[in-house]
Structure formats: structure tokens, C-alpha cells
């Protein structure tokens, strides 16, 4: 599989409508929780929790502070931590407990604490429970958590030094934890946790399972460096620990390696960055999307692999185990265990088959089974991705988070749309197309290019958004910017399953928001723009220039995948000649203007889509170069003031028949532009301008001001 191409379109932060939330002197907006039925987004930041409107995050609804006392700060600083940064309360667990309360934990100056937040009063209940094993001590340490039936399952570090990893269940009746032992967890970096409910038609009355995803240092191989291995681990919700062996410890903890690599190369993505579980009525079972980078990542490589959860469950249910080998001088420290496996199967959930053998709970499992799982937590079989290859591999980018939305295109094809954030504050939107990947667009969410720490998806009909959290705030973006595609060709070439062209309104619309009957819409995921209605008569810009000056003709082609070339009177221009130049790879500069430069200039784009080349006329300019007598400004117009030796040029934009309302003519000056009221569209198809404007006086004409006719703002 080849590297993914660059995003087709890049939207700068100011180009698109993004909602933003941030408060002065508040940082680390890294815990996000969406309550879709309440249309509320909860934000856990440093020492504060906010509730904001999920439809417009800039609208704050509530806030509650959870600060660290000066005494606690001082004690924390005594232990060698920074009073200004580390010895504060970073909210790390923000989980729904009931319809009226959240369970919240924070680092609390290296003394983690948890409390209950009432959603009716938006105040803490003041329980101040010990957060040890539920929340890290250190704000820099990894963590993950999920609430399952009112009980918190978490992966974090258990001690001040951060040296003791733990996966635990916080439960009043049956608390459980991992063994503090290298074979169980070896310096893990926790990434994600989620519950997978047993399927209602499960033949053996299975148990709900909680999955944990992390990267840890390999125990099975030894290299000169610390080889990282991505893992998927799972525990059973019904686990109650063992009676003597594994007392109050998981009896169902098993872990396996996640494989994400290019089949045709030795490139292995072994550091897990994020995971998203995709559940959809159209899927046989959940699919999880995992985001990876290679361990030695000096070139900025990222990959996404997708896995069927059933593949992982198969490994845990029927796979071989590994065992520790006491072989000296060997690179392999763990080997496949080929001996007899006790019954019931070690690490298995208590299902009807196990119950039939009279083991009604993990508490009465035989010691042999428990001792075996204690010593063999690692599976020999690995979990392989769908199609045995990554869905996406991207160079020169460090992806940080992923969410995936399953959507149906106009033709009924279902696409898994991947939204992947970067460490430079951008969001990529990508889809798999047969054996390639298409990055539809890149949106700069955060102006100052800071890493996206958290990504959340709301795919509720009519309110589909992505929420991104960073150190400085939260940004809300729609799933698509369909309206930014101003032509049918642009809309189709975007190959965005959310967008379709509506000929009646001549706009690119979001599929799920439009009331138009789908038969009236145009969407071609192959990118075949020939389906668009013929528009031979497009708008053009007319310019008048002074002899000897320089003209810059604008070409607003947004596609990064398109090559731009210029034609003059239907001949392709050689822009590398002394007469012409390119500005920003797209705009045409014409030097030393003479009457011979008058005529029609067309900017065309050439874009490879699948195996076809699509040509588009992006802009048309009509130039007239004159040796002008000293002109007089028409009395009906205000006099244009120009400053110094700056230039002023008249630009006239004319729409030909068939286009939408005529664009006002604009006089561009160095100090601004004067807009004239638009006239009704002409009845004839003549290309002659119907508005006659006297030329604005020009001082030393060296540069041309211009106007975009199809403005993307």
C-alpha cells in the first residue's frame, strides 16, 4: 500500500466557520464528554469543569472549579514537583455515572482524588474519594477509563513515582486489579478502554468484556533498545477474582499483540496513539480503528489499521499462550507454550459452558486454571487487521487522535470516514477507496498549531460535529464544509460522501441536511465530474491595465492535488519565460504589459482522479492594455484616493447568462475597494460588459490589485 496523498483541500483556520471555547488562564482542555440527549459537552480542564452547548461550544452553560489547596501544593513541591504546573489538579476522569451525575477524578497535586459532580446544581458532592489506581498522580502520565454499569474501569499508574501500572475496577462489592508484575504490564502507555456488550444472540450466554489498549515494552523480545509493542487486553465484567490464587486480582486478564504493518515492507507501526470503536447497525460486530506511529519516527509517519473485534476475541478464546523462557543469552524471552492447557480455559469469561462444568463464578475456578493465567497473561497469537494491511499510511505527519463516522453515499455505498487529528492542530478527513486512500481535506482547527489532545464525534442526525480539545481550548467543526465548494465540479471532485451538488440551487449541500429529493442531487464518489451540467458560459473578470505595468491574475484553485496551467487566447503559456511568472504556484504574473498582452487568459486545472485526468477552467480573465491619456473620473463616482506610489486598477466582474445573481463591480484600490450596486443580469449572452466605468487614475503602475470572483469565504 502506497503512502496516502496529501489532503486534497486545506482549509485555513480563518477560512471556515469553527466554533471555539476557551477561557483566560485555563489550560489543558483534554477531557471531553458528550451528552447527546442534553446537547451538552462537558469539558475537563486544569482545575475546572465546564458545561457548554454542544451545538455551539462557544456558549458556556456552567462551570465548577476544583482547585488544590496551598498546603497540598506545598507538600507536592516538597517532593520535587513544580508548584506552577505539576502541583495542580488536572481533570483526567470525566465519566457519566447517571443521568444526573458525573464521576470526576483529578491528579490533585500528586494526590489523586475523585468526586461526584451533580448535574442539577453543577456542584461537587464533596466526597473526595482516594483516586489512587483510578487516576494518575502525574499529569504527564498516561491513563484511560470507562464506566460500566456504574463501576469505573481504569488503566493508569498506581503510585507517586508512576512506576507501578494498574488496570483496575473500582467497585464496592468486587474491586479487582492487575498483578504488579512485569509479565502483566510492562511500563504501559494507556491509550483507550471501552466495554463491548455481549451479543444478545450469543450462543453461550457470554459476558460483557472491557477492552484496554496500550503500548508497552516488549517482554517477549529483547533488543538493544526498549522495543515497544501495541497491545489489546481484555477482562470480563463478571470477573470476581480468585479465592486464594489471584485473590482480588483479575482472573480473566489476557493481552495480545496488535499488528499494523505494510505487508510489502519491514515498516512496522508499533506505537499505539489512539483507538476508536465503530459500532453500526450495518456491521456484524464492532470494528476498532487504531492509530499508530513507528517507534523510531524521525520522518513523521502515521498509520491507521482497522480490526474486527471478533478477531481479537478469537485470539483470546482459542489462541495459544506464551510462557516465560529462562534461556540465557537469548533474544526471545517468551516462547509459545505447547503444553496442556487446564480446563476451564485460563482467562475465559464465565459463560454457559463453564457454568455447565459447575464453575458458576471465578471464585470457584480451580487453582490450576488461576495459576496458569497468572503466569501466562500473554497470548502467542497476534490480532491482525482487516485485509492484513493499514487503511491509511501518511508521511510527514504525526497523527494524535482518531474518530470514525460511518456514512452512506448517494449511491448507497457505505464509507467509514476517518477524522484524524495532528500534532500541529489540524484535522484530516479520509476515506478508503478500493485499494487507495483519499484524504478529502485538512482543516486547521487551532490557529497556533498546537497538538490536538482529544477528539470526540457527535454523529446524531442534524448535529454532526467533531470536537477537538487542546492545551488552549476546544474547537467544534462540522463533519463537512460542503458549502465551500462553489461549483459542481469542485463538489464532485471533493469525493466527500457527505456532500452532493444540488442543481436547482446551484450549491454543494450536506446530504443529511438537505430536503432535496436525492434524485435531484449529484454525487460521484469516483470523482467523475462529467456528470456535472455543462457550464460553457462562466463568469470572467475584465481588467484594464496601463502599458508597461505588471498584472497579477488570480486563480483560486483550492485543490492541492491539481496542477495549474494558463492559456492565453487558447495557447498554453510557458510561465518560465521572462514575460510570465507564477505567484504562489497559481497566480499568473505578466510583466512589462503591452497592447499585445490584451486578450483572454484562462487558468485551468488538471487533476488525476483514479485513472482519469480531469480538466477544469478555474478562472477567466479578459485583459485590455492601453496607452491611456490622462483620464477623468466619472462624476457619478467618488474620487479614489491612492497613497504614495501605490497603484489602483479597475476590475470588472461580469457574470454571463445562466449564473446566479450578478457580482457587483468593484474598484480595487490600495486603500480598499468601492463596490457598485449590481445591475440585473443581461438578457443577451454577449461578452461585452454592460456596465461602463471610467478608468480610475493610476499612478506609477507596477502592480495590479485583483478580486476573486468565486470567493471561498
Amino acid at each position: 500500500m502506497a503512502f496516502a496523498p496529501m489532503p486534497r483541500i486545506t482549509w485555513e483556520h480563518r477560512e471556515v466557520r469553527l466554533m471555539q471555547f476557551h477561557e483566560p488562564d485555563i489550560y489543558n482542555y483534554s477531557a471531553l464528554l458528550l451528552s447527546e440527549d442534553q446537547d451538552t459537552l462537558y469539558i475537563g480542564a486544569r482545575e475546572v469543569i465546564f458545561a457548554v452547548n454542544a451545538l455551539n461550544v462557544s456558549e458556556k452553560q456552567h462551570e465548577v472549579h476544583w482547585k488544590v489547596s496551598e498546603d497540598k501544593k506545598a507538600k507536592c513541591a516538597e517532593k520535587g514537583k513544580s508548584k506552577q504546573t505539576e502541583c495542580l489538579n488536572y481533570i483526567r476522569v470525566l465519566q457519566p455515572l447517571s443521568a444526573t451525575s458525573l464521576y470526576v477524578c483529578g491528579t490533585n497535586a500528586f494526590q489523586p482524588a475523585c468526586d461526584y459532580l451533580s448535574l442539577t446544581s453543577f456542584k461537587f458532592l464533596g466526597r473526595n474519594e482516594d483516586g489512587k489506581g483510578r487516576c494518575p498522580f502525574d499529569p504527564a502520565h498516561s491513563y484511560t477509563s470507562v464506566i460500566v454499569d456504574g463501576e469505573l474501569y481504569s488503566g493508569t499508574s498506581y503510585n507517586f513515582l508512576g512506576s507501578e501500572p494498574i488496570i483496575s475496577r473500582n467497585s464496592s462489592s468486587s474491586p479487582l486489579r492487575t498483578e504488579y508484575a512485569i509479565p502483566w504490564l510492562n511500563e504501559p502507555n494507556f491509550v483507550f478502554a471501552d466495554v463491548i456488550r455481549k451479543s444478545p444472540d450469543s450462543p453461550n450466554g457470554g459476558d460483557d468484556r472491557v477492552y484496554f489498549f496500550f503500548t508497552e515494552v516488549s517482554v517477549e523480545y529483547e533488543f538493544v533498545f526498549r522495543l515497544q509493542i501495541p497491545r489489546i487486553a481484555r477482562v470480563c465484567k463478571g470477573d470476581q477474582g480468585g479465592l486464594r490464587t489471584l485473590q482480588k486480582k483479575w482472573t480473566s486478564f489476557l493481552k495480545a499483540r496488535l499488528i499494523c504493518s505494510r505487508p510489502d515492507s519491514s515498516l512496522i507501526f508499533n506505537v499505539l496513539r489512539d483507538v476508536f470503536v465503530l459500532r453500526s447497525p450495518g456491521l456484524k460486530g464492532p470494528v476498532f480503528y487504531a492509530l499508530f506511529s513507528p517507534q523510531l519516527n524521525n520522518v513523521g509517519l502515521s498509520a491507521v489499521c482497522a480490526y474486527n473485534l471478533s478477531t481479537a476475541e478469537e485470539v483470546f478464546s482459542h489462541g495459544k499462550y506464551m510462557q516465560s523462557a529462562t534461556v540465557e543469552q537469548s533474544h526471545t524471552k517468551w516462547v509459545r507454550y505447547n503444553g496442556p492447557v487446564p480446563k476451564p480455559r485460563p482467562g475465559a469469561c464465565i459463560d454457559s459452558e463453564v457454568r455447565a462444568a459447575n464453575y458458576t463464578s471465578s471464585l470457584n475456578l480451580p487453582d490450576k486454571t488461576l495459576q496458569f493465567v497468572k503466569d501466562h497473561p500473554l497470548m502467542d497469537d497476534s490480532v491482525t487487521p482487516i485485509d492484513n494491511r493499514p487503511r491509511l499510511i501518511k508521511k510527514d505527519v504525526n497523527y494524535t487522535q482518531i474518530v470514525v463516522d460511518r456514512t452512506q453515499a448517494l449511491d448507497g455505498t457505505v464509507y467509514d470516514v476517518m477524522f484524524v487529528s495532528t500534532d500541529r492542530g489540524a484535522l484530516h478527513k479520509a476515506i478508503s477507496l478500493e485499494h487507495s486512500v483519499h484524504i478529502i481535506e485538512e482543516t486547521q482547527l487551532f490557529q497556533d498549531f498546537e497538538p490536538v489532545q482529544t477528539l470526540l464525534l457527535s454523529s446524531k442526525k442534524g448535529r454532526r460535529f467533531v470536537y477537538a480539545g487542546s492545551n488552549s481550548g476546544v474547537v467544534q467543526a462540522p463533519l463537512a464544509f460542503c458549502g465551500k465548494h462553489s461549483t459542481c465540479e469542485d463538489c464532485v471532485l471533493a469525493r466527500d460522501p457527505y456532500c452532493a451538488w444540488s442543481p436547482p440551487t446551484a450549491t454543494c449541500v450536506a446530504l443529511h441536511q438537505t430536503e432535496s429529493p436525492s434524485r435531484a442531487l449529484i454525487q460521484e464518489m469516483s470523482g467523475d465530474a462529467s456528470v456535472c451540467p455543462d457550464k460553457s458560459k462562466g463568469s470572467y473578470r475584465q481588467h484594464f491595465f496601463k502599458h508597461g505595468g505588471t498584472a497579477e491574475l488570480k486563480c483560486s484553485q483550492k485543490s492541492n492535488l491539481a496542477q495549474v496551467f494558463w492559456k492565453f487566447q487558447n495557447d498554453v503559456l510557458k510561465v518560465e519565460s521572462p514575460k510570465y511568472g507564477l505567484m504562489g504556484r497559481k497566480n499568473l504574473l505578466i510583466f512589462n504589459l503591452s497592447e499585445g498582452d490584451s486578450g483572454v487568459y484562462q487558468c485551468l486545472s488538471e487533476e488525476r482522479v483514479k485513472n482519469k485526468t480531469v480538466f477544469q477552467v478555474v478562472a477567466k480573465h479578459v485583459l485590455e492594455v492601453k496607452v491611456l491619456p490622462k483620464p477623468v473620473v466619472a462624476p457619478t463616482l467618488p474620487v479614489v484616493q491612492t497613497e504614495g506610489s501605490r497603484i489602483a486598477t479597475k476590475v470588472l466582474v461580469v457574470s454571463s447568462q445562466g449564473s446566479s445573481s450578478p457580482t457587483p463591480a468593484v474598484l480595487a484600490t490600495s486603500s480598499g475597494a468601492i463596490t457598485l450596486p449590481p445591475k440585473p443580469a443581461p438578457a443577451s449572452t454577449s461578452c461585452e460588459p454592460k456596465i461602463v466605468i471610467n478608468t480610475v487614475p493610476q499612478l506609477h503602475s507596477e502592480k495590479t490589485m485583483y478580486l476573486k470572483s468565486s470567493d471561498n469565504h
Partner: antibody, heavy 118, light 111 residues
Framework: QVQLVQSGAEVKKPGSSVKVSCKAS????????MHWVRQAPGQGLEWMGQ????????SYNQKFKGKATITVDKSTSTAYMELSSLRSEDTAVYYC???????????WGQGTTVTVSS | DIVMTQSPDSLAVSLGERATINCKAS??????????MNWYQQKPGQPPKLLIY???NLESGVPDRFSGSGSGTDFTLTISSLQAEDVAVYYC?????????FGQGTKLEIK
Amino acid sequence: QVQLVQSGAEVKKPGSSVKVSCKASGYSFSDYYMHWVRQAPGQGLEWMGQINPTTGGASYNQKFKGKATITVDKSTSTAYMELSSLRSEDTAVYYCARYYYGRHFDVWGQGTTVTVSS
Amino acid sequence: DIVMTQSPDSLAVSLGERATINCKASQSVDYDGDSYMNWYQQKPGQPPKLLIYAASNLESGVPDRFSGSGSGTDFTLTISSLQAEDVAVYYCQQSNEDPYTFGQGTKLEIK
């Protein structure tokens, strides 16, 4: 059987350094954390720090940060503790101990006496 | 840091009699119902030897006259019938929170 064998007694001058070794045998060295505990003459036991033999990741009691450096050599199943800038108050018996699943020190080395004297 | 205080500092008990050593932690050493308290025996010139782990679990090979009890902050090591070979210094140690800390030791002698 499982055992930890430590290097012999050392007499050192103030300001110098000493490196104590602890060789493990009879078990998979990489599977268990190794800790170091010191006992000053006539005194109690003090936990100094620990190391993960798989990763070489060490963590220390704040009191011994900058004083002790714990390392491992996996190829020889040996853990080391180096003490720098020795002073007379560093005179003690230093023990290595294996940290077992149940969160306790189940196997101890015989101890290495370090005497700091001018 | 959690401070472990043992009492008494020294104890003289007749052979065959019960010996009880107490250990008090400055804060709870429990986590989710488990008590991370261990007891060690140290004889002169020897390293410490594990007797009891997790407050009440007897290490394999240790005579069953040794037992441990307690939770939270208060723990007890009991020798039900003192033998001559039990003369040693006994240490409690918590492993719930780093830095792991030991009690100052209790010297057990024969009366």
C-alpha cells in the same frame, strides 16, 4: 533454586564512588522488579529504589535521588547500584531484593557492606 | 511518606508463650480491601526473611505458628508459641505507597 548473590564488602574514601552488584539465578531475571534496601549499623531498613530489568527503568526514593544509580545487565542477569560522592553516613549494608507479585520482597541478597572512611 | 511505628521496641517472651508485635501506619495501607503490609524476620548477620505478606498471608516454608492480622492502619504479628530460633528483630513494611517504608524494628528475646 532462586538466589541473589551480591559482591563483596568494600572500603571507600569519602568523595569516591562504589558499584555493588547483585547476580540473579534460578528464575527469569526479566520478569521481576529488583529493589535495593539499605541498613545502617544498628539501624532499621530503608528502601532506596527499584529497577525494571526488562526496560532498565529505575525509580528512586526521593532521599536517594542523586546518590544512587540503579542499572541492570540483562545478558548476565545482574543488577547494579552505584553510590556516588560517598560520605561516612553512607556506611551501611546494602541489600538487593526481588519484588514478588504479592508486592513483597520474597528473596534477598546476602548484603554488601560498604564502609566509608578516610 | 507513610511512617510505620512498631511497638514495643523490644520484647522478652518465655519459650512456648505467645509473642505479639504491633505496627501502626500513619495512614491507611489498604487499597480496595487489600492490606499491603508485610512482616520480615532478621537474624544477626543475615538478610531479612519474609514471613507474612498482604497482612495475613503466610509465606511458603514459614512455620504456621506465625500469623498476621489487621487492616487500614493497625496490624499485628503473632507468634503463637515462641521457639528458640525465633529470636530476631522483626520489621513491618508497607508496600501500598512509595517510598516503601519499614518500621523501626522490634527486638524479640527469650525471657
